[in-house]
């Protein structure tokens, strides 16, 4: 019996097509992905074969301006159009909160949402029963097929799921859901969920009965042949585990924000065995045709976007400094704003001992695009922070060893006055450098301020010890020279999108005026 | 122009087996799935079939399974089917049809295939 | 599977009559996501593979002459040829084109007087 298992995973927003980057679509002949290219590919295919799922494991809030304004209303509406057979949550459907996921998604999704390790207790354990689940039973054809759900157990320090949600370890948590659906007489059963490709390999090789583990967080490209697009893959498709028990797990995730659609192909035999698996990500690219309908119903659903782009978020009494001249050479304020906004959307009170569990933040300033003038009475709109942060990337959470950051620190002016994108505006950081001294030896001063403490100080980097640190995912790539942020992180979350963040920061104090107050000095 | 250019007719012994080729050209041949259509003379049109250029992968109608057998050979932008054990019930005209996004866009000009002793 | 069922199998009109021909399905052909109805009709002329006339049960495929119309939806389909031309001679097949596997209808034999 074989079985077609088409796959997304961490989506986030890109409800319309790309570019090949995942950035806003500029050259409509050469973008990818969106909503409607993905339907025309999942009809295609749901009338050539005949078992076909089509699944998503998590992460589909979070990352335009379509979640910033829908609030996850779009993505229950394109995924029942799409006719998603389940999904997995994802560590950012949290993002708003529980109530953010509970009524624009978990009461209007028409396909089951699931996750065996999240247990809800308190006053949330009745709101919220049956509304997601641990497993879902689907008919396929003349058999059926087990889905079961995991979340990243790190949610609670990534996203908001609030108090009365338990997270437990995805192993622990999975097994007993999978030895229920085998006394149910469940013989095919795939682990779906978000916690990334470390632990989806983890899960294939203990969970006992696993057949197939589709994943997500870790954006993944895999893929066995020569690669369509740029992605470089970091293995073969399907990335075969073999379990404790002895048997041939694939392994699968699709890249991210839509552009490839996952394909892969498993045959079982008559008591649920995986005999062989195969297949290959779909590149969503121009040569498949956007389904006229659904893109229709884009374009009416993207006038309110565009409403809300030019409405005011807050105000700023002060200059908003984001020019080159200023942001590439000293401490800007347009830095600090966005610094303290990436600091403010990371605030989680962890327990007694910490009062947040990140306080430190960098940021390039060759990413900032843009000042802001306050003489336009002040206002700030949707449209001045794209200015500022035209990329559409995202501040994500690293681990990283006192040591790594130092270097990061003296890349910062390893070639300084040359108006390079490589120097780091900062928070939670106090540097001081000696620009005589020989590049590699000019930070003099470097001090980051505590988390476990009850009253937020300065003390100065311990080599050996890991920090958290906030950071576009442009520099935890590498971007900028950073090769020893990519090469010597010891983890990577992503995070929210970059204007989604600043903006909620603004909204929030409403009235803004950073100063530059000496974070970053030159002795 | 999108061209699908099916072989010649034949005329095959009862038993034996016979292998029919359709060669595609003028776009992406990996693109589309490929699809047989039998239609017995004065019939209706029956669905054989499809096979995924891109792997090799067949589905087949139940009817046709064990008779019919689907290939492609991507480096010449060609899909075969080969019928075995022909019986006169097999005598008809055999379609290739590339199925795009939305229906069966294109199709072969149909081979005639007669089986007699 | 969906069984399509046409009717009637053979009509015989004169040259710039109307007709109309149905198409049943035994399971709804309509997409709840993009609202489309997922039914194709074809023209098969004497001695040539069939030819698309209409997709989505209702859209025109580029170049097929606009006396023909497709219309219905859900199970019940219908093509209309406005007014019948001597080249209009052919069989008509309805295709179930939502849900493997693709399943055709047994024809309507369209004659001219």
């Known amino acids: 019996w074989e079985l077609t298992i088409l796959h997304t995973n961490d989506v986030h927003s890109r409800l319309e097509q790309t570019s090949e980057d995942s950035s806003k679509c500029v050259n409509a002949s050469r973008c990818m992905g969106g909503v409607a290219r993905l339907f025309t590919k999942v009809q295609q295919i749901r009338r050539a074969e005949p078992n076909v799922l089509l699944l998503d494991a998590g992460d589909q809030y979070q990352g335009t301006i379509w979640f910033t304004v829908y609030k996850g209303a779009e993505v229950a509406h394109f995924m029942n159009a799409l006719r998603y057979d389940a999904m997995a949550l994802g560590n950012h459907e949290f993002d708003n909160g529980v109530e953010g996921l509970i009524e624009p998604l978990l009461k209007e999704a028409k396909f089951p949402i699931l996750s065996a390790n999240i247990k809800a207790k308190g006053p949330l354990a009745s709101q919220i029963s049956g509304l997601y689940l641990p497993y879902k039973v689907l008919p396929v054809g003349d058999e059926v097929v087990g889905i079961v759900g995991y979340t990243s157990k790190e949610t609670p320090f990534l996203s908001n799921p609030g108090t009365n949600l338990v997270f437990e370890d995805e192993i622990t948590a999975l097994q007993p859901e999978v030895d229920k659906l085998k006394t149910l007489n469940v013989n095919k059963i795939i682990a779906l969920g978000h916690s990334g490709f470390e632990t989806d390999k983890l899960i294939a090789q203990k969970v006992r009965g696993v057949d197939v583990v589709v994943g997500g967080h870790s954006n993944t490209f895999l893929y066995t042949g020569n690669p369509p697009s740029k992605e470089v893959p970091a293995g073969k498709y399907p990335f075969i585990v073999t379990s404790d028990d002895g048997r041939k797990v694939p392994v699968v995730q699709a890249y991210a924000f839509g552009k490839y659609l996952g394909y892969l192909k498993i045959e079982f035999d008559e008591r649920g065995n995986v005999i062989s698996s195969h297949g290959n990500p779909i590149l969503l690219n121009s040569s498949i045709p956007e389904d006229p309908s659904i893109k229709a119903d884009i374009n009416k659903w993207r006038i309110k976007l565009d409403n809300y782009s030019t409405q005011e978020l807050g105000k700023t009494i002060v200059y908003l400094d984001g020019s080159s001249q200023s942001c590439r050479f000293r401490e800007c304020n347009m830095g600090n704003l966005i610094c303290d906004a990436m600091i403010n959307n990371n605030l989680r009170h962890a327990d007694e001992m910490f009062w947040n569990h990140v306080s430190m933040c960098i940021l390039n300033g060759g990413g900032i695009r843009s000042p802001i003038d306050e003489r336009n009475n002040g206002t700030i709109t949707w449209e001045n922070l794209a200015a500022v942060l035209p990329f559409g990337g995202t501040f994500d959470l690293v681990q990283l060893k006192g040591s790594t950051l130092k270097k990061a620190f003296e890349h910062s002016v390893h070639r300084y006055g040359q108006s390079t994108g490589e120097f780091l505006q900062v928070g939670g950081i106090h540097v001081v450098y000696d620009l005589s001294r020989k590049p590699g030896d000019r930070v003099v001063k470097l001090d980051v301020l505590c988390t476990k403490c009850r009253v937020p100080s300065y003390d100065p980097l311990k080599m050996d010890e890991i920090y958290k640190v906030i950071l576009p995912n442009f520099l935890a790539n590498g971007g900028d020279g950073f090769q020893m942020i990519k090469d010597e992180l010891l983890r990577h979350d992503s995070g929210d999108q970059d204007i989604n963040v600043v903006s909620t920061y603004i909204s929030k104090m409403k009235v803004i005026y950073p100063a530059v107050e000496g974070r970053i000095k030159f002795s | 122009e999108v061209q699908l250019q099916q072989s010649g007719p034949e005329l095959v012994k009862p038993g034996a087996s016979v292998k029919i080729s359709c060669k595609a050209s003028?776009?992406?041949?990996?693109?589309?799935?490929m699809n047989w259509v039998k239609q017995s003379h004065g019939k209706s049109l029956e669905w054989i079939g499809n096979?995924?250029?891109?792997?090799?992968?067949?589905n087949y109608n139940q009817k046709f399974k064990g008779k019919a057998t689907l290939t492609v050979d991507k480096s010449s932008s060609t899909a075969s089917m080969e019928l075995r054990s022909l019986t006169s019930e097999d005598s008809a005209v055999y379609y290739c049809?590339?199925?795009?996004?939305?229906?069966?866009?294109?199709w072969g000009q149909g081979t005639t295939l007669t089986v007699s002793s | 599977d969906i069984v399509m069922t046409q009717s009637p199998s053979s009509l015989t009109v004169t040259a710039g009559e109307k007709v109309t021909m149905s198409c049943k399905s035994s399971?709804?052909?309509?997409?709840?996501?993009?609202?489309?109805?997922?039914l194709t009709w074809y023209q098969q002329k004497p001695g040539q593979p069939p030819k698309v006339l209409i997709y989505?049960?209702?859209t025109r495929e580029s170049g097929v002459p606009d006396r023909f119309t497709g219309s219905g939806s859900g199970t019940d389909f219908t093509l209309t040829i406005s007014s019948v031309q001597a080249e209009d001679l052919a069989v008509y097949y309805c295709?179930?084109?939502?849900?493997?596997?693709?399943?055709f209808g047994g024809g309507t034999n369209l004659e001219i007087k």
């Open positions: 049809a590339n199925s795009g996004y939305y229906y069966f866009d294109y």
């Open positions: 003028g776009y992406t041949f990996t693109d589309y799935y």
């Open positions: 096979i995924n250029p891109n792997n090799g992968d067949t």
């Open positions: 399971q709804s052909l309509l997409n709840s996501g993009n609202q489309k109805n997922y």
């Open positions: 989505w049960a209702s």
């Open positions: 295709q179930n084109d939502y849900s493997y596997p693709p399943t």
